[in-house]
């Protein structure tokens, strides 16, 4: 009642290995690492067979089949390439995930290499079975920002793609009678979030109450260069409008806000986010040079009061920009305290501009980012937001532009962008 001698399967083994197998003896067939037992189209780790009374085995010896991890999952804002010939997806094959450069980069700077494991899953040394995350690259425009000193007041045009984070925010408040329409700027922080000044998104009321405009009345344009031609721009409606809870209309303290877009915008050469600074109370140091862009008043012959009185919000057709030095807090405070009117430059603000005037931001530039190049990270960082200016005309002598100090609000911004109230859980790199 002996059963015939067994031959182990290719890439497999039989246990126990005996010279003779008698009635009721059992053997366990298993495969080498990276292979699985294949029996009747079923895949299993081991297979047991028994020597029967009539000297036959209860089953034929199964085969060992190489583990196949299958087609790798697609990566949002990324792609997968095969390192192994013939695009193999079997055990020990390698694939590499990469992000759509230069607009996205891999979180945690992982290699992106995944190997087909013995368990049939694509595995990375660091992330294990989790897929990598492609995050937007911030503060690195596809065109290098030039060193020329240009100005918004009487300035020349910015070129398309120089300020890919620049957003035009148009508010058409149809709840007002008659309807009220104005605009400002903002800066893209991620595919779904715009940073701007609170006063841009405050309902233009006849009293000083701070009430945000309804989200239905906000339209955001990205990748825009010339306001007369919006065909190439991405326009998006708002899912949420968030003003800083402590925004004070009397002194413009905490003049910062967020808009969550209805749907994420595709990034590209003309639409890229700006980086946020590290949370530090100092803000940018005096004399540091920053750039700010906007579609605000660029005609030095038109006075702000004329524009306010006429009711028109005159703007530049083509995006303008200016390079301005940061002014010391003490100098700025002193310049405003010497003026009539209740001007307070708080610790949540900083100033920029030239003592002699001539270069400045102006009405309509509100909410735009004052960006400074960070030598350490080699990124442009939004250190300020265009907030307010003195009673004189834009670009007047010893009247500095005042900017919201973004570094004081970084924690608040992350909190809001990652709060459960946010319409979707969108990841943004800190």
């Amino acid at each position: 009642n002996e059963c015939p001698k067994l031959q182990p399967p290719v890439y497999g083994k039989i246990e126990p290995s005996q010279a003779v197998y008698s009635f009721k003896d059992q053997v366990l067939v298993s495969c080498d690492t990276g292979y699985k037992v294949l029996k009747d189209n079923g895949v299993m780790d081991t297979f047991q067979i028994e020597c029967l009374k009539d000297g036959a085995w209860s089953n034929k010896i199964p085969t060992c089949k190489i583990v196949d991890c299958g087609a790798p999952a697609g990566l949002k804002h990324g792609l997968v390439t095969f390192s192994t010939r013939n695009n193999l997806t079997t055990y020990k094959s390698e694939i590499r995930y990469s992000c759509q450069q230069p607009y996205y980069k891999m979180l945690h700077n992982t290699t992106g290499v995944y190997t087909c494991s013995a368990h049939g899953t694509w595995t990375n040394e660091v992330l294990k079975r989790s897929l990598p995350t492609c995050l937007p690259v911030c503060g690195q425009p596809s065109r290098a920002l030039p060193n020329l000193v240009k100005r918004i007041i009487g300035g020349r045009n910015a070129e398309l793609g120089l300020f890919p984070w620049q957003a035009l925010i148009v508010v058409e408040d149809t709840s007002r009678v008659p309807n009220d329409k104005w605009f400002g700027s903002g800066a893209l922080l991620s595919e779904s979030w715009i940073l701007t000044a609170a006063h841009v998104l405050r309902s233009q009321r006849r009293d000083n109450t701070v009430i945000p405009v309804s989200k239905e009345h906000v339209t955001v344009y990205l990748g825009l260069h010339d306001v007369r031609d919006k065909s190439g721009a991405v326009n998006s409606s708002a899912a949420r409008v968030i003003l800083h809870p402590d925004f004070n209309i009397q002194n413009y303290n905490h003049d910062i806000a967020l808009v969550q877009l209805q749907k994420p915008v595709p990034l590209g050469a003309h639409v890229m986010p700006i980086c946020l600074p590290r949370p530090e109370p100092e803000g940018p140091a005096p004399h540091m040079l920053g750039l700010v862009a906007g579609w605000g008043i660029s005609n030095p012959n038109v006075t702000v009061d004329e524009i306010i009185l006429s009711g028109t919000r005159t703007l530049s057709d083509v995006l303008q920009y200016v390079k301005l030095p940061v002014v010391s807090h003490a100098e700025c405070k002193a310049s405003y305290e010497s003026r009539s009117g209740n001007y307070s430059v708080t610790e949540n603000m900083f100033c920029a501009g030239y003592y002699e005037g001539g270069k400045d931001t102006c009405l309509g530039d509100s909410g735009g980012a004052f960006v400074i190049f960070d030598e350490m990270s080699q990124h442009w960082v939004a250190q300020g937001l265009v907030s307010w200016g003195g009673p004189e005309e834009c670009g007047s002598k010893q009247v500095y532009g005042v900017y919201t100090k973004v570094s004081n609000y970084v924690d608040w911004l992350w909190e809001e962008m990652n709060s459960p109230r946010a319409v979707r859980d969108l990841q943004v790199e800190r």
């Epitope: 408040d173 149809t174 709840s175 007002r176 009678v177 006063h199 309902s203 009321r205 006849r206 009293d207 000083n208 109450t209 009430i211 309804s214 209309i249 009397q250 002194n251 413009y252 702000v304 009061d305 306010i308 009117g341 209740n342 001007y343 307010w388 009673p391």
Partner: antibody
């Protein structure tokens, strides 16, 4: 067109309460606050408070914080003002206004008398 | 609290005359940042609800005749009616909206 229609005149006894209504139509009710103003016979205007229908935020003139309670019913686009512990001093015409005072109700006369 | 004082308390003019009335506030109503004075003017005709004439000290409400003009800044404001008509018989109130709301005592305009 925009209209604010206020409830009819009220004759109430001292110590009692009364609830006045102001029904809005013809504009975005939730996006515009409703103000309430008091005018005693032959006297000037006194601001009582306002309510913002979108989130129910209220602001009151300090002199009316214990006297008036403002509420809204968004489904019917109606604002309400309840006046408590009435005395003869509360006998007045009460107006509601909206869209930042561009539109006013016709007023409700409240008479407090025993 | 901001106190609003109107003067005169009443005045009588003939039709066609120019009239000015004053409103003073106990503190400045100008918000430098917005370059706006938070002051409004209202007209209340006998037996009627008040009507908004001017807001932000000088912006005329739509539909208001251009004979009504608001001016002033800070704490001193004026409402001018360039050529008074018979239908302008009313009490005129100013109101601050710089910090909540406060009405002035009113100026009663009578036609001679």
């Amino acid at each position: 067109q925009v209209q604010l229609k206020q409830s009819g005149p009220e004759l109430v006894k001292p110590g009692a309460s009364v609830k006045l209504s102001c029904k809005a139509s013809g504009y975005t009710f939730t996006s515009n606050d409703i103000n309430w103003v008091k005018q005693r016979p032959g006297q000037g205007l006194e601001w009582i408070g306002w309510i913002y229908p979108r989130d129910g935020t209220t602001k009151y003139n300090e002199e009316f914080t214990d006297k008036a309670t403002l509420t809204v019913d968004v489904s019917s686009s109606t604002a309400f003002m309840e006046l408590h512990s009435l005395t003869s001093e509360d006998s007045a015409v009460y107006f509601c206004s909206s869209v930042e005072d561009s539109y006013w109700g016709q007023g409700t006369l409240v008479t407090v008398s025993s | 609290d901001i106190v609003m004082t109107q003067s005169p308390s009443s005045l009588a003019v003939s039709a066609g005359e120019k009239v000015t009335m004053s409103c003073k506030s106990s503190q400045s109503l100008l918000i430098s940042r917005t370059r706006k004075n938070y002051l409004s003017w209202y007209q209340q005709k006998p037996g009627q609800s008040p009507k908004l004439l001017i807001y932000w000290a000088s912006t005329r409400e739509s539909g208001v005749p251009d004979r009504f003009t608001g001016s002033g800044s800070g704490t001193d404001f004026t409402l001018t009616i360039s050529s008074v008509q018979a239908e302008d018989l009313a009490v005129y109130y100013c109101k601050q909206s710089y910090n909540l709301y406060t009405f002035g005592g009113g100026t009663k305009l009578e036609i001679k």
